[in-house]
């Protein structure tokens, strides 16, 4: 994804352990725009800065995720960090986008591969086929070899997902296409869930 995600991650990584805890607690009670769902408490409290950034972007997308992070940081009295995000927001042109209403009245979710990260890590068995489909177009040679070096399917998928935060939508779509080819019934099962 883009600059907004990186800015959110930078801000969260600048928080102390206690501040990150406080950030999560405030995230559980902050007023959300109509049409957006809340990150489940149980999952939220376990997350480190990277996981939380991914979750913010997948639940709220970059524009609103950035705005929400700013709101919580201001509420915590961390004005300087919030201002840094404000600068990113203005530079990326996210202001106009964030001001619009969400498309449906149901809770917003992220890309399919973000939503089903845990299930995909647990249930994808033909990882090499997926890797071959992504090799060159999405994964560099080094990334491809790093994933293949892992011993179990789960470890391979976990390693593959460590690269996902830097991917744009077309990269995530490429992974989804590969999964639809190699694990169609898994994708259909997850779609129903």
């Amino acid at each position: 994804m883009g600059r907004a995600r990186d800015a959110i991650l930078d801000a969260l990584e600048n928080l102390s352990g206690d501040e990150l805890k406080k950030f999560k607690m405030k995230l559980l009670t902050v007023q959300l725009r109509e049409g957006y769902g809340r990150i489940p408490r149980g999952a939220l409290l376990q997350m480190d800065a990277i996981d939380l950034t991914d979750k913010l972007v997948s639940y709220y997308l970059e524009s609103y995720g950035l705005e929400l992070t700013m709101t919580v940081l201001r509420d915590m009295g961390l004005q300087e960090l919030a201002e840094q995000l404000q600068t990113t927001k203005e530079e990326s042109g996210a202001v106009a986008a964030a001001a619009s209403v969400p498309a449906q009245s149901t809770a917003r979710t992220g890309h399919f591969v973000d939503q089903h990260r845990q299930a995909l890590i647990a249930r994808v068995t033909e990882v090499d086929g997926v890797l071959d489909a992504l090799h060159g177009s999405v994964l560099t040679e080094g990334q491809y070899q790093a994933v293949r070096a892992e011993t179990t399917s789960q470890d391979k998928m976990r390693k593959l997902f460590s690269f996902v935060p830097s991917w744009n939508l077309t990269c995530k779509d490429s992974l989804l296409q590969a999964l639809k080819e190699i694990h169609p019934y898994l994708v259909m099962d997850l779609e129903q869930s």
Epitope: A97, A99, V101, P102, N168, D173, P184, M188, E191
Partner: antibody, heavy 122, light 107 residues
Framework: QVQLQQSDAELVKPGASVKISCKVS????????IHWMKQRPEQGLAWIGY????????NYNDKFRGKATLTADISSSTAYMHLNSLTSEDSAVYFC???????????????WGQGTTLTVSS | DIQMNQSPSSLSASLGDTITITCHAS??????LNWYQQKPGNIPKLLIY???KLHTGVSSSFSGSGSGTGFTLTISSLQPEDIGTYYC?????????FGGGTKLEIK
């Protein structure tokens, strides 16, 4: 409600280029990809590609790679398709369209622009 | 690219009839298939997604079935407003491809 408003019909000469616009309302442009379709008279629909304004990435049908360039301007909530080196084969109705939901395992197009008729003639 | 073959290319039926349009994919597309209706001079309208799911606001006289490579769109109790061209579209893989269309007319 979600709306996609396309620019008016264009009449251009062979060899020229054209930029068709698709202004969205009722949702944030960065929340969904915008896909483009081509329809020639008495022919079916062809998928040109999509652009995701949320991160600027695009995916093209190989048949239209080099012919079409997809962009977006977030500040005006507008997606664009630039078509170059136009010939009579490019004369068609072009539609912008948006998948109905984000996060599904595949796309189904529930929202369409009204179409822009492009005529390439000398 | 996945080829989508639709048949018949045109169809004439009487009011009240039940008609069936078929779509055949050149390879397995599971259930990733959509059906659209396009009335003359109008934009395509989504009818069915995921092979059999009726899109919001679409009349229950439309139904879809099939998986893998063979799919059907059925219109029961044909009405005057059902005239138009019907297209199938696969969403299994890029580039997305459409069937050639079935033009439906009323006798």
């Amino acid at each position: 409600q979600v709306q996609l408003q396309q620019s008016d019909a264009e009449l251009v000469k062979p060899g020229a280029s054209v930029k068709i616009s698709c202004k969205v309302s009722g949702y944030a442009l960065t929340d969904h990809s915008i896909h483009w379709m081509k329809q020639r008279p008495e022919q079916g629909l062809a998928w040109i590609g999509y652009m995701y304004p949320g991160d600027g990435s695009a995916n093209y049908n190989d048949k239209f790679r080099g012919k079409a360039t997809l962009t977006a301007d977030i500040s005006s909530s507008t997606a664009y398709m630039h078509l170059n080196s136009l010939t009579s084969e490019d004369s068609a109705v072009y539609f912008c369209t948006r998948p109905y939901s984000f996060g599904s395992s595949y796309d189904y197009f529930g929202y369409w622009g009204q179409g822009t008729t492009l005529t390439v003639s000398s | 690219d996945i080829q989508m073959n639709q048949s018949p290319s045109s169809l004439s039926a009487s009011l009240g009839d039940t008609i069936t349009i078929t779509c055949h994919a050149s390879q397995n597309i599971n259930v990733w298939l959509n059906w659209y209706q396009q009335k003359p001079g109008n934009i395509p309208k989504l009818l069915i997604y995921k092979a059999s799911k009726l899109h919001t606001g679409v009349s229950s006289s439309f139904s879809g079935s099939g998986s893998g490579t063979g799919f059907t769109l059925t219109i029961s109790s044909l009405q005057p407003e059902d005239i138009g061209t019907y297209y199938c579209q696969q969403g299994q893989s890029y580039p997305y491809t459409f069937g050639g269309g079935t033009k439906l007319e009323i006798k």
